[in-house]
């Protein structure tokens, strides 16, 4: 691959942890001890994009598996997805746009904004196990800060 | 701001093993998302990557010089070190140790180097 | 491959635009970047992923990469331009790969 990854794990800013709910969708609910396995970790790639100081496109890969958080509309909405790719072909450098994702830190938080759809974000309800999604609203009573826990390679 | 000093004897016998050490400055080796480095620099010639380590992974190294070489990390020490055994006098050169942010895809901060002789 | 190729030097006259050249196989298709180095000193990086300027680096310093092709541009060269220019990139195969370097001579 021309790009470099590394592999980590999110967690929202209320502690929730990324899971696997089925083979196409992600939902976020606290986990202790030994469940802590089930979380799913990512494969960030750094790929072509707009970028400033704060902000670097990022593709966000299941690790190991040929499977991208991608945004799409549906029904005129911007929705996120999992979708499959063909591994032989990703990640690359010139990912698709529905494929990237505008990583923003501020105050030690991430923010994943789509590049597709400005301004929406990946988000988490405040409820539990409840699925992973866009959201076009920031600060309210969705969330849409996450942190980032290194992963070994 | 983040500094980087390599350090090191100047002067290896041949087919010993040359040691270099990488103190970092104003940031930690054990922060995610950098790749530290070391490269180097035979007199008047280009730049050869020697490899690096990634502190949540295992470290690369130039296909050309694998079995010779050996990057570690010491976080208590806040350093990074190159190990490389049965030195000749081809790897007579500047040895230089530079921080690369994962994302830039380039090393943006280097050390002033340290030139290392192999002979007798 | 792995190589990137540029020529070994460029002249340009004081004011003018300077371009060097750094070819490798489907080189678009990676992150290329560019470092200058004057005589008895540290590389420092001018550009970053193709295009992008470090801070401190003046806004005459450019770079685009397409093709086989990653390009560093110095518009309205100046004589403390003068220095070798190395271009690199990266891939999960080779890891990183420098060019053998450009001579800038400013006239």
């Known amino acids: 691959a021309p790009v470099r990854s590394l592999n980590c794990t999110l967690r929202d800013s209320q502690q929730k942890s990324l899971v696997m709910s089925g083979p196409y969708e992600l939902k976020a609910l606290h986990l202790q001890g030994q469940d802590m396995e089930q979380q799913v970790v990512f494969s960030m790639s750094f790929v072509q994009g707009e970028e400033s100081n704060d902000k670097i496109p990022v593709a966000l890969g299941l690790k190991e598996k040929n499977l991208y958080l991608s945004c799409v509309l549906k029904d005129d909405k911007p929705t996120l997805q999992l979708e499959s790719v063909d591994p032989k072909n990703y990640p690359k450098k010139k990912m698709e746009k529905r494929f990237v994702f505008n990583k923003i830190e501020i105050n030690n938080k991430l923010e994943f904004e789509s590049a597709q759809f400005p301004n929406w974000y990946i988000s988490t309800s405040q409820a539990e196990n409840m699925p992973v999604f866009l959201g076009g609203t920031k600060g309210g009573q969705d969330i849409t800060d996450f942190t980032m826990q290194f992963v070994s390679s | 701001q983040v500094q980087l000093q390599e350090s090191g004897p100047g002067l290896v016998k041949p087919s010993e093993t040359l040691s270099l050490t990488c103190t970092v400055s104003?940031?930690?080796?054990?922060?995610?998302?950098?790749?530290w480095s070391w490269i180097r620099q035979p007199p008047g010639k280009g730049l050869e990557w020697i490899g690096y380590f990634y502190y949540s992974g295992s470290p690369n190294y130039n296909p050309s010089l694998k079995r010779r070489i050996a990057i570690s990390v010491d976080t208590s020490k806040n350093q990074f070190s190159l190990r490389l055994s049965s030195v000749t006098a081809a790897d007579t050169a500047v040895y230089y140790c530079?921080?690369?942010?994962?994302?830039?895809?380039?090393?943006?901060?280097w050390g002033q180097g340290t030139t290392v002789t192999v002979s007798s | 491959s792995s190589e990137l190729t540029q020529p070994p030097s460029v002249s340009v006259f004081p004011g003018q635009t300077a371009n060097i050249t750094c070819s490798g196989d489907?080189?678009?298709?990676?992150?290329a970047c560019w470092y200058q180095q004057k005589p008895g000193q540290s590389p420092v990086l001018v550009i970053y992923?193709?295009?992008k300027r470090p801070s401190g680096i003046p806004e005459r310093f450019s770079g685009s990469n397409s093709g086989n092709t990653a390009t560093l541009t110095i518009s309205g060269t100046q004589a403390m331009d003068e220095a070798d220019y190395y271009c690199?990139?990266?891939?999960?195969?080779?890891?990183?790969?420098f060019g053998g370097g450009t001579k800038l001579t400013v006239l």
């Open positions: 104003g940031g930690s080796v054990s922060s995610g998302g950098y790749y």
């Open positions: 530079a921080r690369d942010p994962m994302h830039y895809y380039g090393m943006d901060v």
């Open positions: 992923r193709d295009n």
């Open positions: 489907k080189l678009g298709d990676k992150f």
């Open positions: 690199q990139a990266w891939d999960s195969s080779t890891y990183v790969v």
